[in-house]
Interface confidence: low
């Protein structure tokens, strides 16, 4: 014998107790296919959440979120703090993308740099914190008169490599030489503060540049998790 | 033939109680909710509620809480209503109908039984 | 309550003419069903679930509309179709009819 509640459509319940028949769904339900011995709740949207679609007795309820959050989740099962361009959001609020990073939407974290030279290209424009960085043609490209059929090379100048050689290397023997410098005097400075303390009346106690620009930065450690920040769940 | 026979016209004067019969026929009783409907003469159909015939429940519309009692005599494939404290306003045709798993509508109606309150 | 409004209340028409009447609901509903109803009778079962015609219904009678509007319409009237017609809702307690319209013969 077929079962009389398969006659019921959407927007219908059937409930053997009440003579087998299609009842309509009460005030703030729906059914959305045939059949249904319930209706369900329709669904609210309330506080962060507006309604997008209003429920029908045939449809649920659809939510969005009010202005400055983002729907996440199926369904917009979760609304979502916007940050600017250029931050992400952090168990803290919104942080501005640390060095090396963007971001170019509101929400969303901060993805690093395309890394150019992995590619065998040259930064052409530099990257932000809302815009990553654009790739231009290689190295080699960027010499003159280079074109994209190479034309015979040219006689060249018995020293011509000779010369580039030698001027490479006084390069990073200047760099080397500098980076020693630095450090030296580093230890120095740290050998001096130990010894005569008294010189230095507020040893570095003033916060920074640097510690406030890291601080207001979201370079996660590794154990604070993404997401979790500024967000309303249905 | 699937029918719905009504008793016959009422005259009633006010403060009375009246009892209209609806013998249902040809059709399983029990499966089928059945409705009352009002007509006042020249006036539109107001739906008074219905009984469930499967559990003997009761509704009845707003406008027909506290005097209207819908019951059931299951072995007789019988439904009644019942008006108690008959008022003018309660004259009347009043039709029983049979009402369909889906859609909610009625195909088959008594032929209505005509009540009339006057003093 | 859902309260269905019909338009007009009486109307006249001669043979062969087109008719239409309309039904307002309050709240929108999913379907409308109309009813029949000739002088002294019970009422039949004109159009259920807003455009399907009821058993022995002539084709020359149609109905249509959606949400909170809904139409009956007699492609060319015949002094048959003399009678009160009465929208009808069963989308939600309580069920509710419209006040009916009275269709008369010019």
């Known amino acids: 014998l077929q079962d009389p509640c398969s006659n019921c459509p959407a927007g219908t319940f059937c409930d053997n107790n009440r003579n087998q028949i299609c009842s309509p769904c009460p005030p703030n339900s729906f059914s959305s296919a045939g059949g249904q011995r319930t209706c369900d709740i329709c669904r609210q949207c309330k506080g962060v959440f507006r309604t997008r679609k209003e429920c029908s007795s045939t449809s649920n309820a659809e939510c969005d979120c009010t202005p400055g959050f983002h729907c996440l989740g199926a369904g917009c099962s979760m609304c979502e703090q916007d940050c600017k361009q250029g931050q992400e959001l952090t168990k803290k609020g919104c942080k501005d993308c640390c060095f090396g990073t963007f971001n170019d939407q509101k929400r969303g974290i901060c993805r690093p740099w395309t890394n150019c030279s992995l590619d065998g290209k040259s930064v052409l424009v530099n990257g932000t914190k809302e815009r990553d960085v654009v790739c231009g043609p290689s190295p080699a490209d960027l010499s003159p008169g280079a074109s994209s059929v190479t034309p015979p090379a040219p006689a060249r100048e018995p020293g011509h490599s000779l010369q580039v050689l030698t001027l490479f290397l006084a390069l990073t023997s200047a760099l080397l030489l500098a980076l020693i410098f630095i450090t030296l005097l580093f230890s120095v400075l740290k050998w001096i503060r130990k010894k005569f303390p008294h010189i230095f009346k507020q040893p570095f106690k003033k916060t920074t540049g640097a510690a406030q620009e890291e601080d207001a930065c979201s370079c996660r450690c590794p154990q604070e998790e993404e997401g979790g920040g500024g967000g309303y769940e249905l | 033939q699937i029918q719905l026979v009504q008793s016959g016209p009422e005259l009633k004067k006010p403060g009375e109680t009246v009892k209209i019969s609806c013998k249902a026929s040809?059709?399983?009783?029990?499966?089928?909710?059945m409705n009352w409907v009002k007509q006042a003469p020249g006036k539109a159909l107001k739906w008074m509620g219905w009984?469930?015939?499967?559990?003997?429940?009761?509704t009845y519309a707003d406008d027909f809480k506290g005097r209207f009692d819908f019951s059931l005599e299951t072995s007789a494939t019988t439904a009644y209503l019942q008006i108690n404290n008959l008022k003018n306003e309660d004259t009347a045709t009043y039709f029983c109908a049979r009402r369909e798993y889906y859609p909610w509508v009625f195909v088959y109606w008594g032929q209505g039984t005509l009540v009339t309150v006057s003093a | 309550e859902n309260v269905l409004t019909q338009s007009p209340a009486i109307m006249s028409a001669s043979p062969g003419e087109k008719v239409t009447m309309t039904c307002s609901a309050s709240?929108?509903?999913?379907?409308m069903h109309w009813y029949q109803q000739k002088s002294s009778t019970s009422p039949k079962l004109w159009i259920y679930?807003?455009?399907k015609l009821a058993s022995g219904v002539p084709g020359r009678f149609s109905g249509s509309g959606s949400g909170n509007s809904y139409s009956l319409t007699i492609s060319s009237m015949e002094a048959e179709d003399v009678a009160t017609y009465y929208c009808f809702q069963g989308s939600g307690y309580p069920l509710t009819f419209g006040g009916g319209t009275k269709l008369e013969i010019k």
């Open positions: 009984i469930n015939t499967y559990t003997g429940e009761p």
């Open positions: 709240s929108s509903v999913s379907y």
């Open positions: 040809k059709f399983t009783f029990t499966n089928y909710g």
């Open positions: 679930d807003t455009s």
